[in-house]
Amino acid sequence: AESCTSRPHITVVEGEPFYLKHCSCSLAHEIETTTKSWYKSSGSQEHVELNPRSSSRIALHDCVLEFWPVELNDTGSYFFQMKNYTQKWKLNVIRRNKHSCFTERQVTSKIVEVKKFFQITCENSYYQTLVNSTSLYKNCKKLLLENNKNPTIKKNAEFEDQGYYSCVHFLHHNGKLFNITKTFNITIVEDRSNIVPVLLGPKLNHVAVELGKNVRLNCSALLNEEDVIYWMFGEENGSDPNIHEEKEMRIMTPEGKWHASKVLRIENIGESNLNVLYNCTVASTGGTDTKSFILVRKADMADIPGHVFTR
């Protein structure tokens, strides 16, 4: 069953079927004998009771006040009264845009991330049994879709999907043809979950070492799942049998990003390992960032300012 009309302020477009459904409907069924009344007030008029004789466009059913269709002069306040229960709505009927298939003020905006699942389904459960056919338009151009009862788009979003999508339901009532339009303004944005990867610590690191000893250079970064972290050294990586890239360690952060750590192990440090750049790079779709390590003999430490050392 269609849910009740709980919003107190409602804006609708002239010329479309429209209904108000009060929110004590289940209760009303229990007390069939209770007097139930619908009223309208607008401007100078105070609480005029509504009935099918008020207008050929108005229909009353158990819980529902229907307009076939709603027109500009239906703007006003509406009340449903039953015993000590009252519900009130303020209805604003706006002009239809004659130059477009939709009215800008009656558009629902949605933001979809690129490559994420994107769906538009044309449904109208209240008028479902009366709907003959439904068409889906993009920027007022009809889309050719298989299902003309409930046209649907289901896909991974791409930037070209951005636009105004209008579901137009065509229905007959008392021999007349009506249509109901629901429009979505779809904006496609980039994947907002991606971060710019960050290499942790200083960009340049002098590491004090002793010849013949081993050293472990730790490169850590905060990055996205698809980003890569790697070491670059010498003319051709892997030419020095004393240098080993250890297996990368990754830990997921609470935010769904990754803390990655990759160690370069240099064994039996020789003269050839001193004063050369060992570069750790993180690469992403956004570009690259690099931090550098230089091995310095402990005896030469006095020549370098203290703040550049990594111990």
């Epitope: 698809e226 890569v228 990368e248 779709t285 956004g286 570009g287």
Partner: antibody, heavy 115, light 113 residues
Amino acid sequence: QVQLVQSGTEVRKPGASVKVSCKASGYTFTSYGISWVRQAPGQGLEWMGWISAYNGNTDYALKLQDRVTMTTDTSTNTAYMELRSLRSDDTAVYYCARGWYFALWGRGTLVTVSS
Amino acid sequence: DIVLTQSPDSLAVSLGERATINCRSSQSVLYSSNNRNYLAWYQHKPGQPPKLLIYWASTRESGVPDRFSGSGSGTDFTLTISSLQAEDVAVYYCQQFYRTPYTFGQGTKLEIK
């Protein structure tokens, strides 16, 4: 609309320089690197290098690194590629492309190097 | 540098038939930390910029017809067009984005037999 708009055709003499621009729109410029790819007549695609729009870091193909400079202007969302000391074999269509795999390309800029 | 070698250099296939293009990398482009292959496939037609078909070796780009598929891991990769259409005539390139320089294969020219 997401697009990369490149500057127009250039004709240069050998030894001269050329600077090609690539203006990005419709996305956050600093979220993606810009790569430059060229295609000489009758040849395949050649990756020239790229620039990180978020920090300006560059990475160039070894054979071009002493002649090429890539820059960005984040105030105008524009990337630039300058190639110096032009030779006749630099005659090519130069493309800018977004990211590290290239879902978005510019239309290309023809650079002709001829005496 | 990582060298990508495509085979064959050119290929002629009848309309509606299957076309297969191979790409071999001089070193693995599989990143063990996330099990992704850093390889893409492009279609290039004269007078147009290249068009991305496949990335991560097997993920089809949005809007690309499902007759295009990518497979393979590590060093050996394949682009398959399940039923060749006239509009598929082009040069196809593989590209690795595992390490800079982000190299391309030499290209495979696909024609209709």
